[in-house]
């Protein structure tokens, strides 16, 4: 049985979508800024029809490795999933490796495509630049995600976001639209546009198949 709750907002995305939130856990974001980032994720989740049938979500914090807090197959109430998203711990690490988290997304989250009818999107929230030695396979992972029909939407936040990587992601596919913001303060202003863009990329559920009409018998 699907665990659903009534919508919280007028705009409510009811599409077939597997959405992964990837949160930069580097010290380029202060703890306060990271809290704004989490609030943005929670706000977005409020605008999605989260369930195993409609929008499935995953939440991953990345630093030099990746830490999944929510998996696509987690069967929990939307309010509980939002609560878990709000509890993501601030790592404040020296490094946040986009290459590692895209590798994780490719080989762990989307290793098996169990919902081919749904769109697959990775929302990459990035505020830092990984060291060059870590980014050797970056393009390979982006291309691997493209092969698996995973759309990557980078959201660059602040002056240290890796614009070169953002442009490389955009180049890989026309759907890989980037949003570049000067600070976390702009997340709230951009939220509705980002949610609408994600939602438009996902298919609507096909109408339920009805049994063929029974022939009407008339008695003369």
């Amino acid at each position: 049985k699907d665990i659903s709750e009534p919508p919280l907002h007028d705009f409510y995305c009811s599409r077939l979508l597997d959405l992964v939130f990837l949160l930069d856990g580097s010290s380029r974001l202060s703890e306060a800024e990271f809290e704004v980032l989490k609030a943005f994720v929670v706000d977005m989740m409020e605008r999605l029809r989260i369930s195993q049938k409609w929008v499935r979500v995953a939440v991953v914090e990345y630093h030099d490795g990746s830490h999944a807090y929510i998996g696509l197959k987690d069967r929990k109430r939307p309010s509980e999933l939002r609560r878990i998203a709000s509890q993501v711990k601030y790592a404040g690490s020296q490094v946040a490796s986009t290459s590692e988290v895209l590798k994780y997304t490719l080989f762990q989250i989307f290793s098996k495509i169990d919902r081919p009818e749904a769109s697959r999107i990775a929302l990459l929230l990035m505020a830092s630049q990984e060291p060059q030695r870590m980014s050797r396979n970056f393009v390979r992972y982006v291309q691997g995600l493209k092969k698996k029909k995973v759309i990557v939407i980078p959201v660059g936040i602040g002056p240290h976001a890796n614009l070169k990587q953002i442009r490389l992601i955009e180049k890989q596919a026309p759907e890989n639209k980037a949003f570049v913001l000067s600070s976390v303060d702009e997340l709230e202003q951009q939220r509705d546009e980002i949610v609408s863009y994600l939602c438009d990329l996902a298919p609507e559920a096909p109408p339920p198949t009805l049994p063929p009409h029974m022939a009407q018998v008339t008695v003369g």
């Epitope: 703890e31 800024e33 809290e35 989490k38 609030a39 929670v42 609560r83 709000s86 509890q87």
Partner: nanobody
């Protein structure tokens, strides 16, 4: 169990300043100020994080209110300047055990003070 004690409220003329204090009995990760104007809901004002001293301030008071912390005294301050009659409210200090809920939601915070009244007259 964390104990919180606030102080510093009072009556002030519009355009004036006040400094609220909130002392904690134990170590806290985040400390926030909320306020409840008469007949309205309790609303977020500001928060400070002990890990790096970073702060968030509500848009409605940005540029007028600042939150700061004295780690040695385990005390957080809310410096309020250019006060307006609309700032009249009971001000509460709060802290949380864990991070469950967004920073601006009251449900996140486990420990609260009884509140200190701030009245701004025109």
């Amino acid at each position: 169990q964390v104990q919180l004690q606030d102080s510093g409220g009072g009556l002030v003329q519009a355009g004036g300043s006040l400094r609220l204090s909130c002392a904690a009995s134990g170590r806290t990760k985040d400390m926030a100020w909320f306020r409840q104007p008469p007949g309205k809901e309790r609303e977020f004002v500001a928060v400070i994080y002990s890990s790096d001293g970073s702060t968030l301030v509500a848009a409605s008071v940005k540029g007028r209110f600042t939150i700061s912390r004295d780690n040695a005294k385990n005390t957080v301050y809310l410096q309020m300047t250019s006060l307006k009659p609309a700032d009249t409210a009971v001000y509460y200090c709060a802290t949380s055990r864990g991070y469950s809920g967004t920073y601006y939601s009251t449900s996140r915070y486990d420990y609260w003070t009884g509140g200190t009244q701030v009245t701004v007259s025109s």
